[in-house]
């Protein structure tokens, strides 16, 4: 899977959207690596 910073950002946005935004406060692109997915 793509692990560039931009891919991580878009994947996280999708995850936040699907979860209704209910995730930990520090779950942001600069805090998570691609392995977080």
């Amino acid at each position: 899977a793509c692990d560039t910073a931009t891919c991580v950002t878009h994947r996280l946005a999708g995850l936040l959207s699907r979860s209704g935004g209910v995730v930990k406060n520090n779950f942001v692109p600069t805090n998570v690596g691609s392995k977080a997915f």
Partner: antibody, heavy 119, light 107 residues
């Protein structure tokens, strides 16, 4: 409102260095990567690199290694790009850009900084 | 580095028409392509990410499609304000790379 405000135009001599700034507002600066992009006159775009404002980590385009240095100042929510050993080939418009998710999911770009290298 | 080729440097269209701008990647980049519009004298503005998803505020006249190596940006019901350069970008691999742009001219 998310904004990326870049520093003003620069006219510098060959061989000199310059530091361009990009001040972020309207979102949490440390949450999102900051990208830097070069646009030479009449040409398309070249990605220089990105910086993680949370920890200062960087990815560089090999072409710009040794030419560009990307840093951040978290206290002022400002990203910087220093360009060194300038030549006429470095004359261009330089943009900062960041994809945010909160408060809005969008890919924001600064207004651009024009760099002219001339003796 | 991945080369993004926009073979048509210029395209001419009329208000109300539909036009398709194409972009070809030198290797498989999955769906990880963005499209930007750059009006003369302005910064690029993001339109599409992940090949086919519009950013908020982008009119639904703009549609992206494709995956792998072949990508298309379609503009339906072209407006006079669509006079601009349209540029693709891949972000599947570092370094990110951009196409050379397609300049849309309005007849």
């Amino acid at each position: 409102e998310v904004q990326l405000q870049q520093s003003g135009p620069e006219l510098v001599k060959p061989g000199a260095s310059v530091k361009i700034s990009c001040k972020a507002s309207g979102y949490t600066f440390t949450d999102y990567y900051m990208n830097w992009v070069k646009q030479s006159h009449g040409k398309s775009l070249e990605w220089i690199g990105d910086v993680n404002p949370n920890n200062g980590g960087t990815h560089y385009n090999q072409k710009f290694k040794g030419k560009a240095t990307l840093t951040v100042d978290k206290s002022s929510s400002t990203a910087y790009m220093e360009l060194r050993s300038l030549t006429s080939e470095d004359s261009a418009v330089y943009y900062c850009a960041s994809i945010t998710i909160v408060p809005v999911y969008f890919d924001f770009w600064g207004q651009g900084t024009t760099l002219t290298v001339s003796s | 580095d991945i080369v993004m080729t926009q073979s048509q440097k210029f395209m001419s269209t009329s208000v109300g028409d539909r036009v398709s701008v194409t972009c070809k990647a030198s290797q498989n980049v999955g769906p990880n392509v963005a499209w930007y519009r750059q009006k003369p004298g302005q910064s690029p503005k993001a339109l599409i990410y992940s090949a086919s998803y519009r950013y908020s505020g982008v009119p639904d006249r703009f549609t992206g499609s494709g995956s792998g190596t072949d990508f298309t940006l379609t503009i339906s019901n072209v407006q006079s304000e669509d006079l601009a350069d349209y540029i693709c970008q891949q972000y599947n691999y570092y370094p990110y790379t951009f196409g050379g742009g397609t300049k849309l001219e309005i007849k």
